[in-house]
Amino acid sequence: AAPCPDACCPHGSSGLRCTRDGALDSLHHLPGAENLTELYIENQQHLQHLELRDLRGLGELRNLTIVKSGLRFVAPDAFHFTPRLSRLNLSFNALESLSWKTVQGLSLQELVLSGNPLHCSCALRWLQRWEEEGLGGVPEQKLQCHGQGPLAHMPNASCGVPTLKVQVPNASVDVGDDVLLRCQVEGRGLEQAGWILTELEQSATVMKSGGLPSLGLTLANVTSDLNRKNVTCWAENDVGRAEVSVQVNVSFPASVQLHTAVEMHHWCIPFSVDGQPAPSLRWLFNGSVLNETSFIFTEFLEPAANETVRHGCLRLNQPTHVNNGNYTLLAANPFGQASASIMAAFMDNPFEFNPEDPIPVSFSPVDTNSTSGDPVEKKDETPFGVSVAVG
């Protein structure tokens, strides 16, 4: 093959090599960019900045190598358009620092930074942590800070992410109330902070106020939907990002629903209860208090993390005709009480028969000396004789 005269030449089926001295000062308009998985750049003294726009359209890029070039600055969002990037080699450039944000969201298997005049500061605490934790092949590089010694020896006692304290109401909140939340941010080199409110939807009208170091958030005219929803305060500095999530409990009255009994392993009378705080429950059977036992008991399903409603069953283990009747579930919390009833029929009463009915003359054999205490159930056998349930 003839030698490639261009600044960048194809390499393999989806690679590109740019090694001609000083041919590039940016990575705009690389040929065949959208299908590239590998990009190798060397000896580009004029390539000093790597920014978001430079890698736009390189969505398939897996390996990026920029070595022995003039790279001084990599923007925190430079790799936003290359989410599949797994190997990044920026060795032997002029980088003094690299933000934690640059590699956030990437699954880098390899990060090479040797041969750069790194400046030890809290901004490289994340890289020191990679070295400590053996990530990305960093330990093997024995990174040095220019004139300061090994990165591993950099003092880091004062290098912490921001500290957040979110103040929530110190009393319960009712539907229709306004709630003021305050997020107090402490730490060095604070850069940005804000609220994440993606879960709130129609739960309240939101008004943000203030800025670093004290952010205010008013949730106006709250609804019961606000329960179990995360309100998150976040803040970033050169070391990293911190988030704290809180939830606001909004009181509302108990409610209850009952559904038709279903036969599973045991019989189940399904129910749903809601309310904040969580309601206390009581069952009635034919109007009288139902005392739960190991044969009849309430069982809750695993609750959903983001809602107050609880689903469950009144479990009945092998119920007979004596368990047929009216089941009522009472739910109560400080703000209301509710009840729901349902008729359940588990088994016909074998002792109920109409004297007018003809008596069948063909009997199934019955062992009159049977001492078994277990009810015997025979299905689809006709004609049917006398069945006795003992117990």
């Epitope: 009393a171 009712d174 539907v175 229709g176 109330d177 306004d178 009255p253 400080p334 703000f335 009480q337």
Partner: antibody
Framework: EVQLLESGGGLVQPGGSLRLSCAAS????????MSWVRQAPGKRLEWVAY????????YYPDTVKGRFTISRDNSKNTLYLQMNSLRAEDTAVYYC????????????????WGQGTTVTVSS | QIVLTQSPATLSLSPGERATLSCSAS?????MHWYQQKPGQSPRLLIY???NLASGIPSRFSGSGSGTDFTLTISSLEPEDAADYYC?????????FGGGTKLEIK
């Protein structure tokens, strides 16, 4: 000093109406829930109405639901109880009470009470 | 609704003695609160959420209990403790009060 001062009580005929007021001072009224509690002669205390801090939520026991309405005017630091279709059994001393703030657990009691105003329903 | 039954209805003790007032709930409640009411006065919060002493209340008052049985104890009676004492539940709608215990100081 927290003060709650009820007014508006008096003698009213069965079926009549009355509006009680409670003037609050010594605390930030709009940050507290409020309730009305009554005590008939020789009887136990009976809670009759609750209102949230902003007035968006109200609760009543079945004995007065549909007849009594609790409201508040936070700009005037005043709590109200509108009582309609009054019955002889509504005769009592009516207290306004402040909901305490003892943490986000819903089970706070009433920590300050007014001196009460007497309502007599009789023909 | 949850019915609160207080016992005894009347308790007559001498100064310095220990007073034990009981409150029984018809169903389990999360917490119990206690109030003191002197003749011609409004109720005064003594104990909140079963065992916490309200602001300004002397330490001779204490509360305990759980579920359906709760107790207010006055460790060493003072003459000014003569009053009616009410228990109160806020756990389940409608909120209810006990019938009261009248404490007399001999």
């Amino acid at each position: 000093e927290v003060q709650l001062l009820e007014s508006g009580g008096g003698l009213v005929q069965p079926g009549g109406s009355l509006r009680l007021s409670c003037a609050a001072s010594g605390f930030t009224f709009s940050t507290y829930t409020m309730s009305w509690v009554r005590q008939a002669p020789g009887k136990r205390l009976e809670w009759v109405a609750y209102i949230s801090k902003g007035g968006g939520s109200t609760y009543y026991p079945d004995t007065v639901k549909g007849r009594f309405t609790i409201s508040r005017d936070n700009s005037k630091n005043t709590l109200y109880l509108q009582m309609n279709s009054l019955r002889a059994e509504d005769t009592a001393v009516y207290y306004c009470a402040r909901g305490a703030m003892y943490g986000n657990d819903f089970f706070y009691p009433m920590d300050y009470w007014g001196q009460g105003t007497t309502v007599t329903v009789s023909s | 609704q949850i019915v609160l039954t207080q016992s005894p209805a009347t308790l007559s003790l001498s100064p310095g003695e220990r007073a034990t007032l009981s409150c029984s709930a018809s169903s389990s409640v999360s917490y119990m609160h206690w109030y003191q009411q002197k003749p011609g006065q409004s109720p005064r919060l003594l104990i909140y959420t079963t065992s916490n002493l309200a602001s300004g209340i002397p330490s001779r008052f204490s509360g305990s209990g759980s579920g359906t049985d709760f107790t207010l104890t006055i460790s060493s009676l003072e003459p000014e403790d003569a009053a009616d004492y009410y228990c109160h539940q806020w756990s389940s709608y409608p909120w209810t009060f006990g019938g009261g215990t009248k404490l007399e100081i001999k």
